[in-house]
């Protein structure tokens, strides 16, 4: 069996779909094009995945190896506090907003960044190798 993350257990370990990267127990999709946060979320959901929810500092550090200076949307939003799309609070890293419109979270090789959700950015989707498993 795949070793589960904090939020899910992937029941088996097949390979990931084309253009997805297998890392640990999950498949990751790093986009080539750019979209706003909502469109990025829709893209991931349509592929039985979700905008990247990072479970801990270790996962964040490992993923940052694949990132550049360019920011990518992740499943992080400020709704009365920074929370991941699975509802869990951001508690292993820090992000701060410089203006009231910066309510979505992005990541690059240097860390997390608050941004206006309207900015077109690359994005990262995450899913278990089987589409019928938990999203996170």
């Amino acid at each position: 069996l795949c070793q589960g993350s904090n939020y899910s257990t992937c029941a088996s370990c097949p390979s990931c779909p084309d253009r997805w990267m297998k890392y640990g127990n999950h498949c990751y999709y790093f986009s080539v094009e750019e979209k706003d946060w909502n469109s990025s979320l829709e893209f991931c959901l349509a592929r039985d995945s979700h905008l990247l929810v990072i479970t801990d500092n270790q996962e964040m550090s490992l993923l940052q190896v694949f990132l550049s200076e360019a920011f990518c949307w992740i499943g992080l939003r400020n709704n009365s506090g920074w929370r991941w799309e699975d509802g869990s609070p951001l508690n292993f890293s820090r992000i701060s907003s410089n203006s009231f419109v910066q309510t979505c979270g992005a990541i690059n090789k240097n860390g997390l960044q608050a941004s206006s959700c309207e900015v077109p950015l690359h994005w990262v989707c995450k899913k278990c190798p089987f589409a019928d498993q938990a999203l996170f």
Partner: antibody, heavy 120, light 107 residues
């Protein structure tokens, strides 16, 4: 190089209307919030209005709310300020300004300004 | 609305002097403060954001500090081109309020 060029200023009578334009170049206009800031002769800076990337959200200073409308045409890389019911106190140099990116709403780049004079 | 108050309103100094301009917010704005320089007949120039982060291309003799309600802009050694009017600005929320300006003149 980021360039913002304002136009449309001039002399207008109280109660009149005017539309200012700001032509943007040297950056991807459709990625940035844009704003108007004004400066009355011999006075300080006053924020007037800000518009989101898509144009779906607009924000105004109380002094111009209901009289001024900020808009943008991303296909034309142009920002607008429609001013109506103009008053003597609206006399100022009007600057177009671009934010710092990602919704960082400081005014990182400024145009050279266009003078609006409201007088009978 | 948050009010921004600068002091002094004007200041005379000489080339080589160390100069400090103060900006006070009417309530806690954390670090959401920008500074601008404006010369007569010109558009303002962006200097600093988040109270202390220098904009690209701004000389290192400029520095910003403070958080909460009290902020300062310091020029460590005045150069002839630094004589201008300086404005602080709250950049987190609406309205984006400016201070009234500090005019830095040659003594």
């Amino acid at each position: 190089e980021v360039q913002l060029v304002e136009s449309g200023g001039g002399l207008v009578k109280p109660g009149g209307s005017l539309r200012l334009s700001c032509a943007a170049s040297g950056f991807t206009f459709s990625r940035y919030y844009m704003s108007w800031v004004r400066q009355a002769p011999g006075k300080g800076l006053e924020w007037v209005a800000t518009i989101s990337i898509s144009g779906g959200s607009t924000y105004y200073a109380d002094s111009v709310k209901g009289r001024f409308t900020i808009s943008r045409d991303n296909a034309k890389n142009t920002l607008y300020l429609q001013m109506s019911s103009l008053r003597a106190e609206d006399t100022a140099v009007y600057y177009c300004a671009r934010e710092g990116g990602y919704g960082n709403l400081w005014f990182a780049y400024w145009g050279q300004g266009t003078l609006v004079t409201v007088s009978s | 609305d948050i009010q921004m108050t600068q002091s002094p309103s004007s200041l005379s100094a000489s080339v080589g002097d160390r100069v400090t301009i103060t900006c006070r917010a009417s309530e806690n704005i954390y670090s959401a403060l920008a500074w601008y320089q404006q010369k007569p007949g010109k558009a303002p120039k962006f200097l600093i954001h988040n109270a202390k982060t220098l904009a690209e291309g701004v000389p290192s003799r400029f520095s910003g500090s403070g958080s909460g309600t009290d902020f300062t802009l310091t020029i460590s050694s005045l150069q002839p081109e630094d004589f201008a009017t300086y404005y602080c600005q709250y950049h987190y929320g609406i309205p984006f309020t400016f201070g009234q300006g500090t005019k830095l003149e040659i003594k």
